[in-house]
């Protein structure tokens, strides 16, 4: 049996407010910032997590600036607009009426414009490459052990179906994890690769989104896997539309 009802907390999202006001007095949790009900048996969408993060008091935030290595998501944090399912709206605007189009992981994929900018559809990010460098160890990790442990991590901690972990590459000290998920492959109830990658990124940075205060404990054959830098590359089903001016800058 589970003691979760006694505590009424959300194991998969610490940025929630929970109370036993659901049907039959069941624990119900709502995301900070949006107030949207979340399913605590799975990951919360990145859009709702970003919204919750931006709504948190400034003194409660830790390490909110994006890493200097975040070469792709270089706009960093913003307060996003989410649709009723918690996904990013295709068009995002700030308070000064500057607008841009984003992909399904909330990363800008066009030049910035004004309120007349149109974003016809939310373009799916179907391929995510997570590039890690681990801290020095006594020797290299065994590739097959590393591969198996990372696949198990994504399956058990992030609840991502194994078929979406396309590959794990390793050339000491660089580890690359490839996540692939086309629109046609994603069934109802499947965790989105963008959400899994975001939870993993926050775990690696020591900013776990899970309720427990311990944080990620990842080992390969008992040897801790400690990451010293992370790069995440996003590939969309439709290529992004940036002007040549940006590309040559």
């Amino acid at each position: 049996h589970t003691a979760a009802q006694d505590n009424c907390t959300c194991p998969t999202n610490k940025m929630t407010v929970c109370s036993p006001d659901g049907p039959g007095g069941r624990c119900q949790c709502r995301a900070l910032g949006s107030g949207m009900a979340v399913d605590c048996s799975t990951l919360t969408s990145k859009c709702l997590l970003l919204k919750a993060r931006m709504s948190a008091p400034k003194n409660a935030r830790t390490l909110v600036r994006p890493s200097e290595h975040a070469l792709v998501d270089n706009d960093g944090l913003y307060d996003p607009d989410c649709d009723p399912e918690g996904r990013f709206k295709a068009r995002q605007c700030n308070q000064t009426s500057v607008c841009w189009c984003v992909n399904s992981v909330g990363v800008r994929r066009t030049d910035k414009g004004d309120l007349s900018l149109r974003c016809d559809e939310l373009v799916r990010t179907h391929h995510i490459l997570i590039d890690l460098r681990h801290r020095p160890t006594a020797g290299a990790f065994n590739h097959s052990d590393l591969d198996a442990e990372l696949r198990r991590l994504f399956r058990e901690r992030y609840r991502l179906h194994p078929k979406f972990v396309a590959a794990v590459h390793y050339e000491q000290p660089t580890i690359q994890i490839e996540l692939r998920q086309n629109t046609s492959q994603k069934a109802a109830g499947d965790v989105d690769i963008g959400d899994a990658a975001y939870y993993f990124e926050r775990d690696i940075k020591g900013e776990s989104l899970f309720q427990g205060r311990g944080g990620l404990d990842l080992r390969v054959r008992g040897e801790p896997l400690q990451v010293e830098r992370t790069l995440i590359y996003y590939l969309d089903e439709i290529p992004p539309k940036f002007s040549m001016k940006r590309l040559t800058a």
């Epitope: 049996h1 589970t2 003691a3 979760a4 006694d6 505590n7 907390t9 194991p11 998969t12 198990r152 991590l153 058990e156 901690r157 776990s208 899970f210 309720q211 427990g212 205060r213 311990g214 944080g215 990620l216 404990d217 990842l218 080992r219 008992g222």
Partner: nanobody
Framework: QVQLQESGGGLVQPGGSLRLSCAAS????????MAWFRQTLGKGLEGVAI????????YYADSVKGRFIISRDNSKNTLYLQMNSLRPEDTAMYYC????????????????????????WGQGTLVTVSS
């Protein structure tokens, strides 16, 4: 859903030993921090011992240090508690518990919020220490 089933409790004389076992239904418990708790009439619920998923780090309540040993066999999805030099004050219902999230670092055994980390519980096994 994680399901846990304790066994091995019973009546034992002071100074005696018992070994409790906890069988887990779910393969994913192999990557979860696990713990033993006990409930007594006098003291309420108390954390007894915690073990990380790799089985390399263990944590004990001061009242059982040097007498109890927590261990696990992930190939059998089983948690153990070896109880030696038992005392009458060890009489309690013993529960095994599993952490909410796999690959999560174990909480401190003295953390007042420890129960939040362990939502999955067995039904318990009764240990009675009496002459």
């Amino acid at each position: 859903q994680v399901q846990l089933q304790e066994s091995g409790g019973g009546l034992v004389q002071p100074g005696g030993s018992l070994r409790l076992s906890c069988a887990a239904s779910d393969y994913s418990t192999g990557r979860r921090c696990m713990a033993w708790f006990r409930q007594t009439l006098g003291k309420g619920l108390e954390g007894v011992a915690i073990i990380d998923y790799a089985g390399t780090s263990t944590y004990y309540a001061d009242s059982v240090k040097g007498r109890f040993i927590i261990s696990r066999d992930n190939s059998k999805n089983t948690l153990y508690l070896q109880m030696n030099s038992l005392r009458p004050e060890d009489t309690a219902m013993y529960y095994c518990a599993a952490a909410a999230i796999p690959y999560e670092r174990c909480p401190d055994i003295s953390d007042p919020q420890i129960l939040v980390s362990f939502p999955y519980w067995g039904q318990g096994t009764l240990v009675t220490v009496s002459s």
